[in-house]
């Protein structure tokens, strides 16, 4: 069998809401994957499990089952959404995300995804990890690849 390639493309959109009383941030993050089947037979994408971390703390998980099948030498683009919650010991981020005086409300999140494919009763798992920027201050739609992680530092003005 030839390889099945999984490529994490990036964040497609992030929709944010807040609970003012609980100082809690809710982020629905939609990600995009490209899955390429390099075989001369069809494969099933059985499930996708995803996890999102902020500062090494898991803030969201998702699992999609029985997603699709990919034909021979074909590629499919799959979107999946991970609901995340930044709360409790991380609730200091509420102020970072909502203070008007802060001009940039991006946070760096680690996106982890595992794709399980099956063919002829054989199962294969492929995992990817990427750091991505997500804006926690407003609803944002990204051009693919736009949220890739870089690093610069400045104080709140």
């Amino acid at each position: 069998p030839r390889s099945i390639d999984v490529k994490y493309i990036g964040v497609k959109s992030a929709y944010v809401s807040y609970d003012v009383q609980k100082r809690t941030i809710y982020l629905n993050i939609t990600n995009t994957l490209n899955i390429t089947n390099n075989n001369y037979y069809s494969v099933e994408v059985e499930n996708i499990t995803a996890q999102v971390q902020f500062a090494k703390t898991v803030i969201g998980k998702a699992r999609l089952n029985n997603i699709t099948h990919i034909g021979p030498l074909d590629m499919k683009q799959i979107d999946y959404t991970v609901p995340t919650v930044i709360a409790e010991e991380m609730s200091y981020m509420y102020d970072f995300c909502t203070l008007i005086s802060i001009k940039v409300h991006n946070i760096v999140l680690m996106m982890q995804v595992t794709v399980t494919t099956t063919y002829f009763g054989h199962s294969e798992q492929i995992s990817q990890e990427r750091y991505q920027y997500v804006d926690c201050g407003r609803n944002t739609t990204y051009q693919l690849g736009q949220s890739e992680y870089l690093n610069v530092l400045q104080p709140q003005q």
């Epitope: 500062a55 102020d95 970072f96 991006n106 992680y149 870089l150 610069v152």
Partner: antibody, heavy 125, light 107 residues
Framework: EVQLQQSGPELVKPGASVKIPCKAS????????MDWVKQSPGKSLEWIGH????????FYNQKFKGKATLTVDKSSSTAYMELRSLTSEDSAVYYC??????????????????WGQGTSVTVSS | DVQITQSPSYLAASPGETITINCRAS??????LAWYQEKPGKTNKLLIY???TLQSGIPSRFSGSGSGTDFTLTISSLEPEDFAMYYC?????????FGGGTKLEIK
Amino acid sequence: EVQLQQSGPELVKPGASVKIPCKASGYTFTDYTMDWVKQSPGKSLEWIGHINPNDGGTFYNQKFKGKATLTVDKSSSTAYMELRSLTSEDSAVYYCARWVYYYGISYEGGAMDYWGQGTSVTVSS
Amino acid sequence: DVQITQSPSYLAASPGETITINCRASKSISKYLAWYQEKPGKTNKLLIYSGSTLQSGIPSRFSGSGSGTDFTLTISSLEPEDFAMYYCQQHNEYPWTFGGGTKLEIK
């Protein structure tokens, strides 16, 4: 010049309450959150909690819930901390401190970049 | 809560020397640690934030390093005004917690 001006020493009786002001100047009061810190005699620093002057939203160290109440008066750019049901354990110096967030392309952390001079509270009958 | 163990609690040194103060967190706090200086009659001063970034206006003889659980404040070529109390503080998660402090005295 950023300044956080706190009131002078307080001598209070056990069971009483005290309200400590922290008047901010030299910056826009609502642009930064305010933290409060306790320093008991001969001891280290303990974080009490923090308040966002925009909406009055607070987060407390569990240890100080029910003991401390944080409020702000935006019109006078003043943060307050009220301590109630005072005991000898509450005798300490209390500091207010401005919390600054650091960021570039994204969140990079924070710190207390300006501190008040501290208010000494002595609980004694 | 994240416990911060600061060492040593007391340090005697001479002007011109280089000293290090350590802080260890009970769990990973990424790079989210700040260092402060406390001197009698003065307001507390922020020295370092995000583990290693020097606060504006602080002399370059102060430096910070570390991430995860182990952090170090280094003061090279000690000046007379550096003899003071030093504290580290984590801000990776609520409640913020401080180290026990290090008293730096002139030998």
